[in-house]
Amino acid sequence: PTGAVEVQVPEDPVVALVGTDATLRCSFSPEPGFSLAQLNLIWQLTDTKQLVHSFTEGRDQGSAYANRTALFPDLLAQGNASLRLQRVRVADEGSFTCFVSIRDFGSAAVSLQVAAPYSKPSMTLEPNKDLRPGDTVTITCSSYRGYPEAEVFWQDGQGVPLTGNVTTSQMANEQGLFDVHSVLRVVLGANGTYSCLVRNPVLQQDAHGSVTITGQPMTFPPEA
């Protein structure tokens, strides 16, 4: 409608690391003579319309979302209706709607993408002694407490991708963070290096682990 309050949010998702604070930006253009007494602001979960935080009747009504949200009170009068979400959790991921009502009303939805980096993979070998060329071994690459689910890639010492005989499992813990275990079954050559790369698709962060088998003994590269 003509003259309806225009509510603006970022088009791209806001990416926030687990445990950090995130700002969900939202703005509107106040008309001349605007006062906070005219403003009714509602932040809500888009899908359910559950209340997250509100500013009505000229005052901040506080957080309705685990007491982890806050507005920027000094900036509201300039049209900054952004929401601060503290100590981000995996469960916070999703769409939030900023609903602004002054003389008329408008709304816009902003997406929150939660992320957590994966730990440096630990490598284990089974069996891990008396290895000879021709033996079949299983190499397990484990990386912990990341989000969202990882992409896992294996390669040999020459950088050739290894795609056969790979089994990857990802399990979420009680916080929703994933532990990834990827198992490569290979037939040993005279010697060889096997690397696993655990990629966080949101952070574009790669965590590398490798094991080098040189007949006997077997060596693990030092931790980076």
């Epitope: 899908d47 359910t48 319309k49 559950q50 009505t56 009502s101 008329d104 009303f105 939805a109």
Partner: antibody, heavy 124, light 109 residues
Framework: QVQLVQSGAEVKKPGSSVKVSCKAS????????INWVRQAPGQGLEWMGG????????NYAQKFQGRVTITADESTSTAYMELSSLRSDDTAVYYC?????????????????WGQGTTVTVSS | DIQMTQEPSLTTSPGGTVTLTCRSS?????????ANWVQEKPGQAPRGLIG???KRAPGTPARFSGSLIGGKAALTITGVQPEDEAIYFC?????????FGGGTKLEIK
Amino acid sequence: QVQLVQSGAEVKKPGSSVKVSCKASGGTLRPVLINWVRQAPGQGLEWMGGIIPLFGTANYAQKFQGRVTITADESTSTAYMELSSLRSDDTAVYYCARDQVVATSGVNFGMDVWGQGTTVTVSS
Amino acid sequence: DIQMTQEPSLTTSPGGTVTLTCRSSTGAVTTSNYANWVQEKPGQAPRGLIGGTNKRAPGTPARFSGSLIGGKAALTITGVQPEDEAIYFCALWYSNLWVFGGGTKLEIK
């Protein structure tokens, strides 16, 4: 259970105005958006505008801008829709429908409660 | 102006499954459009069936379900009953206004 009860049928002359009421019984108008939707004979549903009674703020479809005024009286849980400069093609059934601004139950049922409709006939 | 497209008419048989869709001229329908589905029968006021894309309104039978399919809002009726013969309208929210589709007339033969 909330019910929306609308005022009775109206017959109006071209150029005049009509004011239709919508009273919420068994509940409150807050925190909701009361929408006004019309249906001309043999046509589909058309959103005209809506009001948030708690805030007293209204929006209108561009087509009706300047010709429709939507108001609400929180004390009587009643919303009103006034349409002016009536023409014959405004002959229609006018409905109010409740939509939640904030879903207090945590579930967004959308436009789940509708009034029974008010027939407005514009004829000279 | 925002245009919304629904199938003008669909025919199904009792006990069958039918899916009605609602396409927006602005692009893919998302959860922030809060797709609503409204049923209208002759001589009766419209009845809200589905809100918020997939939430059944109180009293809506379980055979009605809402979803997003291929960028469109969809209403699926599983195990169609003769009393489901009606016109079904979708409505989408765009920041500050609702827009209704033209309606789908569902015939049961």
